[in-house]
């Protein structure tokens, strides 16, 4: 069977959405009412990769765009960013590493680590308006605890 | 034994609210999600809500979405829907089942309680 | 929404009978689907898993096959406790839905 991919937004610990910042950028923000709807929506894909009751390996593709969150060195940091892929090829069970995260969900917190870089977690910052970036250090200033809203396709 | 039991059902005028209440015994409560799955009188199966094991990721289909909310007391190993703005077409049996989104399938299941939404 | 349509709706048979039950999905579910057997005034009962796995305590007489839009649920030999509702359900995309369901009698 084909990769199941399901759709649904993420908050982080502090209520701040998700939403497009440029065409390669995400950045969190506090959103009410109308503007809830400018929130990025993923197409979350259960990919293979070590899997526990509390760590489920994931891609986070963007719904509808040839666009998912990948890990690679930047100048030597383990860096988020938003990569194009051909939509012919993508998602697939088998994805490359760069694209996975474990969503890890223990006492009603969920991160998302890359799969590539252990110990590293999509995180926003406590600012508003800042960018989605990827993390070196749980439990600091820097968020990485996050809430999932599942929505229908 | 693996067991589920649900309580809060009852009747209740249009626009009111009624909270749910399933326990659980037999199995790590924590360790699994859940949901609520609904049943219309002499109708079929709909699934309302799904929640989590840890409480970090819940569901809502279109029909209740706004209006229902579940959440889960893992010390307590209990799970709850709230339930409000109530209509006339959510009287049903409201089932707790253990399962949801990941693994797709409901495989533990209470005995249902019944509400009755009328004026 | 991906709609489950059950064929037939009610059925009647003998004790000892092979029986099937259809179920027809809207679009390509890639044998993401369950059974569930519901006697009544009971709860539903989970029967079959990824379309033709058994589920834990479930006795072999009961099967599933099927693949892309077309399920099929048997019962290889109808014993009187399976009188009951079957129901099919997809876990493709969301919402996740049943079919309808098909009554079983015993004639």
């Known amino acids: 069977a084909p990769v199941r991919s399901l759709n649904c937004t993420l908050r982080d610990s502090q209520q701040k959405s998700l939403v497009m910042s440029g065409p390669y950028e995400l950045k969190a923000l506090h959103l009410q009412g109308q503007d809830m709807e400018q929130q990025v929506v993923f197409s979350m894909s259960f990919v293979q990769g070590e899997e526990s009751n509390d760590k489920i390996p994931v891609a986070l593709g963007l719904k509808e765009k040839n666009l998912y969150l990948s890990c690679v060195l930047k100048d030597d940091k383990p860096t988020l960013q938003l990569e194009s892929v051909d939509p012919k090829n993508y998602p697939k069970k088998k994805m490359e590493k760069r694209f996975v995260f474990n969503k890890i969900e223990i006492n009603n917190k969920l991160e998302f680590e890359s799969a590539q870089f252990p110990n590293w977690y999509i995180s926003t910052s406590q600012a508003e308006n800042m960018p989605v970036f990827l993390g070196g250090t749980k439990g600091g200033q820097d968020i990485t605890d996050f809430t999932m809203q599942f929505v229908s396709s | 034994e693996v067991q589920l039991v649900e309580s809060g059902g009852g009747v209740v005028q249009p626009g009111r609210s009624l909270r749910l209440s399933c326990s659980s015994s037999g199995f790590i409560f924590s360790r699994y999600d859940m949901s609520w799955v609904r049943q219309a009188p002499g109708k079929g199966l709909e699934w309302v809500a799904y929640i989590s094991h840890g409480g970090a990721g819940t569901y809502y289909p279109d029909s209740v979405k706004g209006r229902f909310t579940i959440s889960r007391d893992n010390s307590k190993n209990t799970l709850f829907l709230q339930m409000d703005s109530l209509r006339v077409e959510d009287t049903a049996v409201y089932y707790c089942?253990?399962?949801?989104?990941?693994?797709?399938?409901?495989?533990?299941w209470g005995q249902g309680t019944p509400v009755t939404v009328s004026s | 929404d991906i709609q489950m349509t059950q064929s037939p709706s009610s059925l009647s048979a003998s004790v000892g009978d092979r029986v099937t039950i259809t179920c027809r999905a809207s679009?390509?579910?890639?044998?993401?689907l369950n059974w569930y057997q519901q006697t009544p005034g009971k709860a539903p009962k989970l029967l079959i898993y990824?379309?033709?796995e058994l589920a834990e305590g479930v006795p072999s007489r009961f099967s599933g096959s099927g693949s892309g839009t077309d399920y099929t649920f048997t019962i290889s030999s109808l014993q009187p406790e399976d009188i009951a509702t079957y129901y099919c359900q997809h876990f493709w995309r969301l919402p996740y839905t049943f079919g309808q369901g098909t009554k079983l009698q015993i004639t």
């Open positions: 089942a253990r399962g949801g989104v990941y693994k797709g399938y409901f495989d533990v």
């Open positions: 679009g390509n579910i890639y044998t993401y």
């Open positions: 990824n379309a033709k």
